[in-house]
């Protein structure tokens, strides 16, 4: 009776269940009634990183230092490379595929600290009360306008992305 | 594609003034946050002045409040930076900065050298 399921590390082909190329190589070949499954170790700059029947590796992330990306961690034959941004500059996501010198804050979000040398920006929701309608990386969140204070009556409530609107008190003849 | 010149750097004797400016283009030069970044020799990148879209809002760093002035021309689609009673901490490769700025975007920057 030909399998239907594999075990851990196995794959099922023409009826049979062949061994995974372990990480670091790739398949030559599957397995026969009578031979093993081949696996080749994948070559300079490739990398494959799970039990895997793959016929080609994965060429390693490049580090474009024209992007500002350097070299973190070097791949290797079962890793890929890990890139990070050069100094002072911050990575645009967690793949890290390009930098930039520093994070805005999105309208909604007021920043809270500037970015340093050594820490990006630092953003806050703005609290009721407040509001940001720009991206800035420097602006705080800035406080509804009183329209109290303008003798003037609220229109339109404020967010935390915009002010308020006055207008003028309706007079009672 | 983002492009950035700056010019107006040179040698100046402390205590006197420069003015910097970048000219900008391959965006939408009044929508954007617009900032001053500074590399000493052998130091990190240090964020001098920002300036909002409108020209309303700025921010100074405290090494140079007082002392540099940020403002932008929009019909001109350009960005300055009024240097006054400078010093020679102030020496740096100034470049000009869109925000999000991106590696990618640098300008060549403009070399200001304070030195008696």
């Known amino acids: 009776e030909p399998p239907t399921a594999c075990r851990e590390k196995q794959y099922l082909i023409n009826s049979q269940c062949c061994s995974l190329c372990q990480p670091g190589q790739k398949l030559v070949s599957d397995c026969t009634e009578f031979t093993e499954t081949e696996c080749l170790p994948c070559g300079e700059s490739e990398f494959l990183d799970t039990w895997n029947r793959e016929t080609h590796c994965h060429q390693h992330k490049y580090c474009d230092p024209n992007l500002g990306l350097r070299v973190q961690q070097k791949g290797t034959s079962e890793t890929d490379t890990i890139c990070t941004c050069e100094e002072g500059w911050h990575c645009t996501s967690e793949a890290c595929e390009s930098c930039v010198l520093h994070r805005s804050c999105s309208p909604g979000f007021g920043v809270k600290q500037i970015a340093t040398g050594v820490s990006d920006t630092i953003c806050e929701p703005c609290p009721v009360g407040f509001f940001s309608n720009v991206s800035s990386a420097f602006e705080k969140c800035h406080p509804w306008t009183s329209c109290e204070t303008k003798d003037l009556v609220v229109q339109q409530a404020g967010t935390n992305k915009t002010d308020v609107v006055c207008g003028p008190q309706d007079r009672l003849r | 594609e983002v492009q950035l010149l700056e010019s107006g750097g040179g040698l100046v004797q402390p205590g006197g003034s420069l003015r910097l400016s970048c000219a900008a283009s391959?965006?939408?030069?009044?929508?954007?946050?617009m900032w001053w970044v500074r590399q000493a020799p052998g130091k990190g990148l240090e964020r001098v002045s920002a300036?909002?879209?409108?020209?309303?809002?700025?921010y100074y760093a405290d090494s140079v409040k007082g002392r540099f002035t940020i403002s932008r021309d929009n019909s001109k689609n350009t960005l300055y930076l009024q240097m006054n009673s400078l010093r020679a901490e102030d020496t740096a490769v100034y470049y000009c900065?869109?925000?999000?700025?991106?590696?990618?975007?640098r300008g060549q920057g403009t070399l200001v050298t304070v030195s008696s």
């Open positions: 900065a869109k925000l999000p700025f991106r590696f990618s975007d």
């Open positions: 391959g965006f939408t030069f009044r929508d954007y946050e």
């Open positions: 300036i909002n879209p409108q020209g309303t809002r700025t």
